[in-house]
C-alpha cells in the first residue's frame, strides 16, 4: 500500500566558499547553507554540531524538517525564522543543546506550519512570555504547535535573575491563548518546586505531559479535572510524598490517563493508606507493582501494592507537656 | 518496502486464549506507535487498542470491549508487535490488523500502513 | 468517545460519475481524519490524510475535504477499479473510531 512518509535519501553538504559567494542574493530553491547537509527529497536540514552563533538566513524553502542542534545560537530573536518566500512547510524544529539563553518575543513567528518544537538542553534563563505567541495580545492568533519540548531548559542558580523559573516557563505557555491546541508538553529536568495552578486548565489539548526529574513535592493544588483527553502524565523522579484524594479521584475520571510515578520518596504512614487502597483498585498506573516506600525507615522499600492498613500508621501526637526536644 | 505480517490466528473456543504477532520491515519500527484493528465478518473496522513507544514508557491503551481481556507488547529488538487475547468471547471473531501510527501528535496521517490480517474464530 | 457517522452507507454510480461520501464527528476533531479504501479480502489502504491532503501515489480523482465535525470525501469520475468499501477514521482522541464504511458499487 501507500504511504506519505519521505523515501529517504543521502544529505548534500554544501560548499562554504559557494553559500559566501551567493549570500548577497536570494536564496537559490535547492541551496544548501554552510555547515549544514540538505535533503531535498527527505526536506530535511541539518546543521548539527557546527558551532553556529545565528540561524542560517538562506535556509532552503522546501524544508520540513530543520535540526540546529549542538550549536552557539546564545539568542534567537524576534523572527529567527522569518524569510522571504517563507519557511511554510516548516513543521519540526530542533534546538536543542545549542547553548541558547535568551529566546525573544516573536522569535518563531512565520512559521505557519511549525507543529513540533524542541528547545531542550538550553539553559533559557530569559524566555520571552511572548516567545511562542508571538504578540502581547490577551488573546493572540492561535500557534500551530502541537508539541513543545522543553527539558532541562532550567538555566544555572546564578543565571535565574531573581524571578521564579516556573513562573517565566509558565508565562511564555499562557501568553495570549495561543497554545491552545499544543497536544504535548515535555517539562522534564527543569528543577520545578511547584506547578502553578492555572497552567493545566489553559491547555485544554494536552495529550501528554511530562514533568519527570522535577522537584514537585506536591499535587495539592493542581488540578487535572479539565484535561479530559490526557493520555499520559509523567511524574517519576520527583519529590512526591502521597497523592492526597482530590487528586486520586481527578486522576481516575480521565477516561484514557496512563500516569507513570516511579522513583518518588512515598512516605508510607496513615495519609498513605487511601492512595494505597486506590493503586490496588486503578488501571491508569502503569508500573504501579515498582512503587515503594522511602519513609519512614522501617518502612523503606516496601512494596505499597502489598501494604494494608495495619502497616500504615502515624505516631501519636504527644502533649505539649511529654513532648520532648 | 514496509512490511506488516501477521500470524497466530486460528480457531480457539470461547473462554481460550490465543497470541497473535506482527513482524515489522522496512521501517524504523522504534519509532511508531502500533496498532491493532479488527474486523468483524461482513462488519466495519474496529480499533483495538495500541502501544507507544519506549520514551513513552511502552504505554498501552484499548477500546473498552477488550479492556482487561487482551494485552498488547511490543520486542522492538525483534521489529515485533503481540497482541495477547485472554477469555475470549464469539464477538471476538474476526480478522485482526496490525497498524502503524506515527509516534507524535503532529503526526498527518493517523494509520498509514497495515498488514494483511490474520483471522481468528472463536466458537464451540 | 467520538462517534464517526458516515453516510450513505452503500452506493450505486455509474464509470465517470462523481461520487461524495461524508463522515460527520459528534465533536470537533481538527483535521485529524484519513480516508481508507478497502477492497473484499484486503487490507484498508490510506487515500487521504489530514482530511484533505493525498497520499503520493493515489490517483489525483480522490480528494478530501472538511475541518471540524463535517468531512467529505470525493471521487471525481468512478473508475471500476474504485469498487470498494470507503472509511473514514479520526484520529484525534482516543479511543480512534472509524466511520461505518460506504460501499461503493457500478450500475
Known amino acids: 500500500s501507500s504511504s506519505p512518509t519521505s523515501s529517504a535519501s543521502s544529505f548534500s553538504s554544501s560548499a562554504p566558499f559557494l553559500a559566501s559567494a551567493v549570500s548577497a542574493q536570494p536564496p537559490l530553491p535547492d541551496q544548501c547553507p554552510a555547515l549544514c547537509e540538505c535533503s531535498e527529497a527527505a526536506r530535511t536540514v541539518k546543521c548539527v554540531n557546527r558551532n553556529l552563533t545565528e540561524v542560517p538566513t538562506d535556509l532552503p524553502a522546501y524544508v520540513r524538517n530543520l535540526f540546529l542542534t549542538g550549536n552557539q545560537l546564545a539568542v534567537l530573536p524576534a523572527g529567527a525564522f522569518a524569510r522571504r518566500p517563507p519557511l511554510a512547510e516548516l513543521a519540526a524544529l530542533n534546538l536543542s543543546g545549542s547553548r541558547l539563553d535568551e529566546v525573544r518575543a516573536g522569535a518563531f513567528e512565520h512559521l505557519p506550519s511549525l507543529r513540533q518544537l524542541d528547545l531542550s538542553h538550553n539553559p533559557l534563563a530569559d524566555l520571552s512570555p511572548f516567545a511562542f505567541s508571538g504578540s502581547n495580545a490577551s488573546v493572540s492568533a492561535p500557534s500551530p504547535l502541537v508539541e513543545l519540548i522543553l527539558n532541562h531548559i532550567v538555566p544555572p542558580e546564578d543565571e535565574r535573575q531573581n524571578r521564579s523559573f516556573e513562573g517565566m516557563v509558565v508565562a511564555a505557555l499562557l501568553a495570549g491563548r495561543a497554545l491552545q491546541g499544543l497536544r504535548r508538553l515535555e517539562l522534564a529536568s527543569n528543577h520545578f518546586l511547584y506547578l502553578p495552578r492555572d497552567v493545566l486548565a489553559q491547555l485544554p489539548s494536552l495529550r501528554h505531559l511530562d514533568l519527570s526529574n522535577n522537584s514537585l513535592v506536591s499535587l495539592t493544588y493542581v488540578s487535572f479535572r479539565n484535561l479530559t483527553h490526557l493520555e499520559s502524565l509523567h511524574l517519576e523522579d520527583n519529590a512526591l510524598k502521597v497523592l492526597h484524594n482530590g487528586t486520586l479521584a481527578e486522576l481516575q475520571g480521565l477516561p484514557h490517563i496512563r500516569v507513570f510515578l516511579d522513583n518518588n520518596p512515598w512516605v508510607c504512614d496513615c495519609h498513605m493508606a487511601d492512595m494505597v487502597t486506590w493503586l490496588k483498585e486503578t488501571e491508569v498506573v502503569q508500573g504501579k507493582d515498582r512503587l515503594t516506600c522511602a519513609y519512614p525507615e522501617k518502612m523503606r522499600n516496601r512494596v505499597l501494592l502489598e501494604l494494608n492498613s495495619a502497616d500504615l500508621d502515624c505516631d501519636p501526637i504527644l502533649p505539649p507537656s511529654l513532648q520532648t526536644s | 518496502e514496509v512490511q506488516l505480517v501477521e500470524s497466530g490466528g486460528g480457531l480457539v473456543q470461547p473462554g481460550g486464549s490465543l497470541r497473535l504477532s506482527c513482524a515489522a520491515s522496512?521501517?524504523?519500527?522504534?519509532?511508531?506507535?502500533m496498532n491493532w484493528v479488527r474486523q468483524a465478518p461482513g462488519k466495519g473496522l474496529e480499533w483495538v487498542g495500541e502501544?507507544?513507544?519506549?520514551?513513552?514508557?511502552?504505554?498501552?491503551y484499548y477500546a473498552e470491549s477488550v479492556k482487561g481481556r487482551f494485552t498488547i507488547s511490543r520486542d522492538d529488538s525483534k521489529n515485533s508487535l503481540y497482541l495477547q487475547m485472554n477469555n475470549l468471547k464469539t464477538e471476538d471473531t474476526g480478522v485482526y490488523y496490525c497498524?502503524?501510527?506515527?509516534?507524535?501528535?503532529?503526526?498527518?496521517?493517523?494509520?498509514?500502513?497495515w498488514g494483511q490480517g490474520t483471522l481468528v474464530t472463536v466458537s464451540s | 468517545d467520538i462517534q464517526m457517522t458516515q453516510s450513505p452507507s452503500s452506493l450505486s454510480a455509474s464509470v465517470g460519475d462523481r461520487v461524495t461520501i461524508t463522515c460527520k464527528a459528534s465533536?470537533?476533531?481538527?483535521?485529524?481524519l484519513s480516508w481508507f479504501q478497502q477492497k473484499p479480502g484486503k487490507a484498508p489502504k490510506i487515500l487521504i490524510y489530514?482530511?484533505?491532503r493525498l497520499v503520493d501515489g493515489v490517483p489525483s480523482r480522490f480528494s478530501g475535504s472538511g475541518s471540524g465535525k463535517d468531512f467529505t470525501f470525493t471521487i471525481s469520475s468512478l473508475q471500476p477499479e474504485d469498487i470498494a468499501t470507503y472509511y473514514c477514521?479520526?484520529?484525534?482522541?482516543?479511543?480512534?473510531?472509524f466511520g461505518g464504511g460506504t460501499k461503493v458499487e457500478i450500475k
Open positions: 522496512g521501517f524504523t519500527f522504534s519509532n511508531y506507535w
Open positions: 502501544i507507544r513507544l519506549k520514551s513513552d514508557k511502552y504505554a498501552t
Open positions: 497498524a502503524r501510527r506515527r509516534g507524535y501528535y503532529g503526526s498527518a496521517y493517523g494509520m498509514d500502513y
Open positions: 477514521l479520526q484520529y484525534d482522541f482516543l479511543p480512534l473510531t
Open positions: 489530514r482530511a484533505n
Open positions: 465533536q470537533d476533531i481538527n483535521s485529524y
